[in-house]
């Protein structure tokens, strides 16, 4: 709601005239009256509205972890396998198919 | 109404470990994240960590790893604090408190806390 | 690490006085500080969160204002029942930090 959006952005999203609330993953950009995609400014001092996003962003550059919005933090999947969220599949899976638990080949 | 109700006072010996739990109702367990605060005899506020009720994951200061694990029981909405190899300097009130997701509840910050648990670590 | 410094540690005054204290973060961390107060023998509350925004039910004599670096925190027209220790925090970025405190004695 715009309530919402108000009380958890009062900064970088007021236009003057309205609120305009962007996809997560993008800031309004008052100048250029549009959203802007956050990855833009994520080497910059960030926008609060894209500070969740950029960290997120760096988090999956490192291997066999994911960003947790509830935590707001990179954690190690490697600590949660077996009840892993979908951003940890890949690794968690592969953790499991890894040659010491492979059959032999016939 | 949101409750979070911690375990009593306890009185250990150094090197021991001790398990402090955190009893919450009145809200949705998973969708919070639960964390714990130390607050030495008369300073301030210090977090220790938190974790995700979801699947466990945790995130800890980095003065707290190999102090403090966090653990829950998403069957009874419980919330665990362990701290172990305890010295006099461990001897403190730790509160739990619980924080929402920052995009889907409006984010309130640490909104409720528990009534703390004093640990006091003595020969 | 962000580290907050909060001043002053101390403040003494009168029921009906104005009172402010500040806080200041090592970097910027947007408007993400939360005001917290603690009574005795009481476990901590929230008052203010985002910088400026007050929670379900705080009394509007406490208001919380800045951006960036520099916050601070007022209470208008001190009442009694205030009497507590005010602390703020960054909630920008993991670990999360609080301020030293600020203990309000009422004369």
């Known amino acids: 709601s715009r309530v919402d959006q108000e009380e958890r952005f009062p900064q970088g999203l007021w236009t003057g005239v309205a609120m305009r609330s962007c996809p997560e993953e993008q800031y309004w950009d008052p100048l250029l009256g549009t959203c802007m995609s956050c990855k833009t400014i994520c080497n910059h001092q960030s926008q609060r509205t894209c500070a969740a996003f950029c960290r997120s962003l760096s988090c999956r550059k490192e291997q066999g972890k994911f960003y947790d919005h509830l935590l707001r933090d990179c954690i190690s999947c490697a600590s949660i396998c077996g009840q892993h969220p979908k951003q940890c599949a890949y690794f968690c899976e592969n953790k499991l198919r890894s040659p010491v638990n492979l059959p032999p080949e016939l | 109404e949101v409750q979070l109700q911690q375990s009593g006072p306890e009185l250990v010996k150094p090197g021991a470990s001790v398990k402090i739990s955190c009893k919450t109702s009145?809200?949705?367990?998973?969708?919070?994240?639960m964390h714990w605060v130390q607050q030495s005899h008369g300073k301030s506020l210090e977090w220790i960590g938190g974790?995700?009720?979801?699947?466990?994951?945790?995130s800890y200061n980095q003065k707290f790893k190999g102090k403090a694990t966090l653990t829950v029981d998403k069957s009874s909405s419980t919330a665990y604090m362990e701290l172990r190899s305890l010295t006099s300097e461990d001897s403190a009130v730790y509160y739990c408190?619980?924080?929402?997701?920052?995009?889907?509840?409006?984010?309130?910050?640490?909104?409720?806390w528990g009534q703390g648990t004093s640990v006091t670590v003595s020969s | 690490s962000i580290v907050m410094t909060q001043t002053p540690k101390f403040l003494l005054v009168s029921v009906g006085d104005s009172i402010t204290i500040t806080c200041k973060a090592s970097q910027s961390v947007s408007n993400d500080v939360v005001w917290y107060q603690q009574k005795p023998g009481q476990s901590p509350k929230l008052l203010i969160y985002?910088?400026?925004n007050r929670y379900t039910g705080v009394p509007d004599r406490f208001t919380g204002s800045g951006y960036g670096t520099d916050f601070t925190f007022t209470i208008t027209t001190v009442q009694a029942e205030d009497l507590a220790v005010y602390f703020c925090q960054q909630d920008y970025s993991s670990p999360w930090a609080f301020g030293g405190g600020t203990k309000l004695e009422i004369k």
């Open positions: 985002y910088a400026s």
């Open positions: 009145g809200y949705t367990f998973t969708e919070f994240s």
């Open positions: 408190a619980r924080r929402g997701d920052y995009y889907g509840n409006l984010y309130y910050a640490m909104d409720y």
């Open positions: 974790i995700n009720p979801n699947h466990g994951g945790s």
